[in-house]
């Protein structure tokens, strides 16, 4: 349910990588020299003065913003809003370092992997034979040959 | 259903400030942020900055910093954008927007009618 | 800030046939695998309308008549088969960094 991160962290490290390949690994270009990253929760503000040296790094907005990883962008990531009119609501809130989680909302549920959206669980006419959870509709009991 | 009115016309005199009103019904306000857009006269649309009316938090397009001051009175599900010392190159229909969220791409899904600026002596 | 280049700026296409605008960005509004990408339809007098969110979604109450593809730095709408009701001008918008941007537009005629 919650947001993958792994993803994005090889998107934002293979993106950094394609302007470094003049510093070690671990270093970025900032300028003329090759930098430390900024630490996760910060976004960089100014290049380093000297090669290895540390960036001036200021802190994303929180609850706004978010960084989970070591980097060397200017900006930070906008916090992902549960969108309570595709059926989510927050699981977890976002932090500095860590991007808002959202689940199902109650009575909502979502079987694939990494929902962007949940759909409403399905009400049975002829009785539940299992309930709805986050992950499966309901499982609805078929109407008797008899009672047709 | 969802809706966002705007009042049609503000005429404005250089120099001079307006503030433009966006009053939202069929939702929950606080639940979405709101985004406004200018489009002059004949041309393309232009991202001014957003609103979270759970907080006030704003984001500004760096170009409108110091020209739009974006409010909002949860009370009465309204969002407000004041644009400070016009000139003609203000003169603008203005559009409020309510924003989606997919998968962290905002999108706006629902636009205002528009308020036509006209700044003139 | 991100450009994006509409192409053609304008064009016309008969009833029935497929039009199909581009649009093309500075540089990539992709991230994590996902497409940071919408298009809007605007008439004259009325405010810009969603079509497509995060490139390829179509939304709710718009005819599947109009699909979006693409990633990167390229993507398509295309509009098959076009009707009269058509007729507007087309702007893509990317959300993956502020400041969020559209571009130029494209004008539909029919034919």
């Known amino acids: 349910q919650g947001t993958n991160s792994i993803s994005e962290s090889l998107k934002l490290r293979r993106r950094v990588r394609e302007t470094d390949k003049n510093c070690s690994e671990g270093l970025y270009q900032g300028g003329p020299f090759c930098c430390q990253p900024c630490q996760p929760g910060k976004k960089k503000v100014e290049d380093c003065k000297m090669n290895g040296g540390t960036p001036t790094c200021a802190p994303c907005t929180e609850g706004k913003e978010y960084m989970d990883k070591n980097h060397y962008a200017d900006k930070c990531r906008r916090c992902t809003l549960c969108d309570e009119e595709h059926g989510l609501e927050v699981e977890t809130n976002c932090t500095l370092t860590q991007n808002t989680k959202c689940k199902c909302k109650p009575d909502f549920y979502c079987d694939s992997p990494g929902c962007e959206h949940c759909v409403r669980c399905a009400s049975c006419e002829h009785g539940t034979l299992e309930p709805c959870t986050a992950t499966s509709n309901t499982n609805c009991r078929k109407q008797s040959p008899r009672n047709r | 259903q969802v809706q966002l009115q705007q009042p049609g016309a503000e005429l404005v005199k250089p120099g001079a400030s307006v503030k433009l009103s966006c009053k939202a019904s069929g939702y929950t306000f606080t639940s979405y942020w709101m985004q406004w857009v200018k489009q002059r006269p004949g041309q393309g649309l232009e991202w001014i900055g957003e609103i979270d009316p759970s907080d006030s938090y704003t984001n500004y397009n760096q170009k409108f910093k110091g020209k739009a001051t974006l409010t909002v009175d949860t009370s009465s599900s309204t969002a407000y954008m004041q644009l400070s010392s016009l000139t003609s190159e203000d003169s603008a229909v203005y559009y409020c927007?309510?924003?989606?969220?997919?998968?962290?791409?905002?999108?706006?899904?629902?636009w205002g009618t528009g308020t036509t600026v006209t700044v003139s002596s | 800030d991100i450009v994006l280049t509409q192409s053609p700026a304008s064009l016309a296409v008969s009833l029935g046939q497929r039009a199909t605008i581009s649009c093309k960005a500075s540089q990539s509004v992709d991230y994590d695998g996902d497409s940071y990408m919408n298009w809007y339809q605007q008439k004259p007098g009325q405010p810009p309308k969603l079509l497509i969110y995060a490139a390829s979604n179509l939304e709710s109450g718009i005819p599947a008549r109009f699909s979006g593809s693409g990633s990167g730095t390229d993507f398509t709408l295309n509009i098959h088969p076009v009707e009269e009701e058509d007729a507007a001008t087309y702007y893509c918008q990317q959300s993956n960094e502020d400041p969020r941007t559209f571009g130029g537009g494209t004008k539909l005629e029919i034919k």
């Open positions: 927007a309510r924003n989606r969220d997919y998968s962290n791409n905002w999108y706006f899904d629902v």
